[in-house]
Interface confidence: low
């Protein structure tokens, strides 16, 4: 991969349908402990290692060339819980138009095995520059993986790698409104391998979700559901062992 990842490119909204402009913390990372390609708990876990590895300090090689990673991130080894109080961020009520998610993350499930299907609450919904990171391992002989970003009973963004659809591997994206699925968007590039670890990163942009797998840009999916702040849950399901699921702001 080229060494041209920058925050500016990731957020500039260029018309490139297959942009390589992920933030510095996304791309071209050396493999870290635990065998996650690209980095060991990068992105949403600045300064924090996988369970049992490098306690209290950053894993080796994380964030080369990405100074500061995520400003305002917690000190090494610290895993803050989400703010108390009802509803969204900040805890005084629903998020304001600006600063709804100050970059103080990550929030989400602590690192460690998680039960699948798993629901990651997104208490204030999603907002542009929000980065969701999911780490796990595909089970042997896997059939499917699914991420469902949900607004009430609607599925705003369904990301569904299928390992054997008519003897082909394909990623299907869609939206479900009023129990009706819309037009499918299909992607034949398939970066998942049965039995192997993976990292999925979803970057929320004003007009679309941008998805990278193992530090390589995969696809983008235009928003079909308005009111992003009400997409308040991420469902993770399928044939995976889930290690962690979290989000932060970049």
């Amino acid at each position: 991969m080229a060494d041209n990842f920058s925050l500016h490119d990731a957020l500039s909204g260029s018309g490139n349908p297959n942009p390589q402009g992920w933030p510095g913390a996304w791309g071209n990372q050396p493999a870290g402990a635990g065998g996650y390609p690209g980095a060991s708990y990068p992105g949403a876990y600045p300064g924090q290692a996988p369970p049992g590895a490098y306690p209290g300090q950053a894993p080796p090689g994380a964030y080369p060339g990405a100074p500061g990673a995520y400003p305002g991130a917690p000190a090494p080894g610290v895993y803050p819980g989400p703010p108390s109080g009802p509803g969204a961020y900040p805890s005084s009520g629903q998020p304001s138009a600006t600063g709804a998610y100050p970059a103080t993350g990550p929030y989400g499930a602590p690192a460690g095995p998680l039960i699948v299907p798993y629901n990651l609450p997104l208490p204030g919904g999603v907002v542009p520059r929000m980065l969701i990171t999911i780490l796990g391992t595909v089970k042997p002989n896997a059939n499917r993986i699914a991420l469902d970003f949900q607004r009430g009973n609607d599925v705003a963004f369904h990301f569904n790698p299928r390992f054997n659809e008519n003897n082909r591997r394909v990623i299907v994206c869609n939206t479900k409104l009023d129990n009706n699925w819309g037009r499918e968007e299909r992607q034949s590039v398939f970066p998942f391998e049965s039995g192997k670890p993976f990292k999925i990163q979803v970057l929320v942009e004003p007009d679309h979700f941008k998805v990278a797998v193992n530090d390589a840009h995969l696809l983008q999916y235009n928003h079909r559901v308005k009111k992003l702040n009400e997409i308040s849950k991420l469902g993770i399901s399928g044939d995976i062992d889930l290690t962690s699921a979290s989000y932060t702001m970049i």
Epitope: Q94, A97, G152, L177, P206, E230
Partner: antibody, heavy 116, light 109 residues
Framework: QVQLQQSGAELMKPGASVKISCKAT?????NYWIEWVKQRPGHGLEW???????????HYNEKFKGKATFTSDTSSNTAYIHLTSLTSEDSAVYYC?????????WAQGTTLTVSS | QAVVTQESALTTSPGETVTLTCRSS?????????ANWVQEKPDHLFTGLIG???NRAPGVPARFSGSLIGDKAALTITGAQTEDEAIYFC?????????FGGGTKLTVL
């Protein structure tokens, strides 16, 4: 097709409370947010807030917190707005609106008059 | 709270193209504001025209279109009809609340 039918006009005394209903037909009631909007002559349209019957989620305009409360009865596909401590400032037409990806479906409105 | 501003009144002729705009006091209107356009006709009859900046509602004539023009949301009626005479409200979404504009009274003479 999608239809929203609100309850009839209300004449209330200051200090009283009122509950306005909005019956939905033609779609899955629990899946869509219901917005509530207030219209007063000379004041245009004001968003009171919204309510998702499926899980009880709600958002309120700060101005109407303590004044309005949203509820629903999913067995009858009916949404409600409960207005308390009524004053003449609450005299208005109140609308329920089904929020959708590409459009809003508006009910016919309920006229509330608060007068002693 | 943000203030949303519309032209108070516009006049057009049948067959002409007219554009109504919607400005936000907080800066440029973006797709994240999910601009909605609603038509009000006499007797409190409201019809949703456009949602999510540029998505035309089912059954709404193709002459109605939504867009962003410069730093504002816009509703364009291409080939106005006499039945388009109405008040048009825009509404902008601000992270967790909706704000309506004051409405534009469109006269089609």
């Amino acid at each position: 097709q999608v239809q929203l039918q609100q309850s009839g006009a209300e004449l209330m005394k200051p200090g009283a409370s009122v509950k306005i209903s909005c019956k939905a037909t033609g779609y899955t009631f629990t899946n869509y947010w219901i917005e509530w909007v207030k219209q007063r002559p000379g004041h245009g349209l004001e968003w009171i807030g919204e309510f998702l019957p499926g899980d009880g989620s709600s958002h309120y305009n700060e101005k109407f917190k303590g004044k309005a409360t949203f509820t629903s009865d999913t067995s009858s596909n009916t949404a409600y707005i409960h207005l308390t401590s009524l004053t003449s400032e609450d005299s208005a037409v109140y609308y329920c609106v089904r929020d959708d990806y590409d459009s809003d479906y508006w009910a016919q409105g309920t006229t509330l008059t608060v007068s002693s | 709270q943000a203030v949303v501003t519309q032209e108070s009144a516009l006049t057009t002729s049948p067959g002409e193209t007219v554009t109504l705009t919607c400005r936000s006091s907080t800066g440029a209107v973006t797709t994240s504001n999910y601009a909605n356009w609603v038509q009000e006709k006499p007797d409190h009859l409201f019809t949703g025209l456009i949602g999510g900046t540029n998505n035309r509602a089912p059954g709404v004539p193709a002459r109605f279109s939504g867009s962003l023009i410069g730093d504002k949301a816009a509703l364009t009626i291409t080939g106005a009809q006499t039945e388009d005479e109405a008040i048009y409200f825009c509404a902008l979404w601000y992270s967790n609340h909706l704000v309506f504009g004051g409405g534009t009274k469109l006269t089609v003479l």
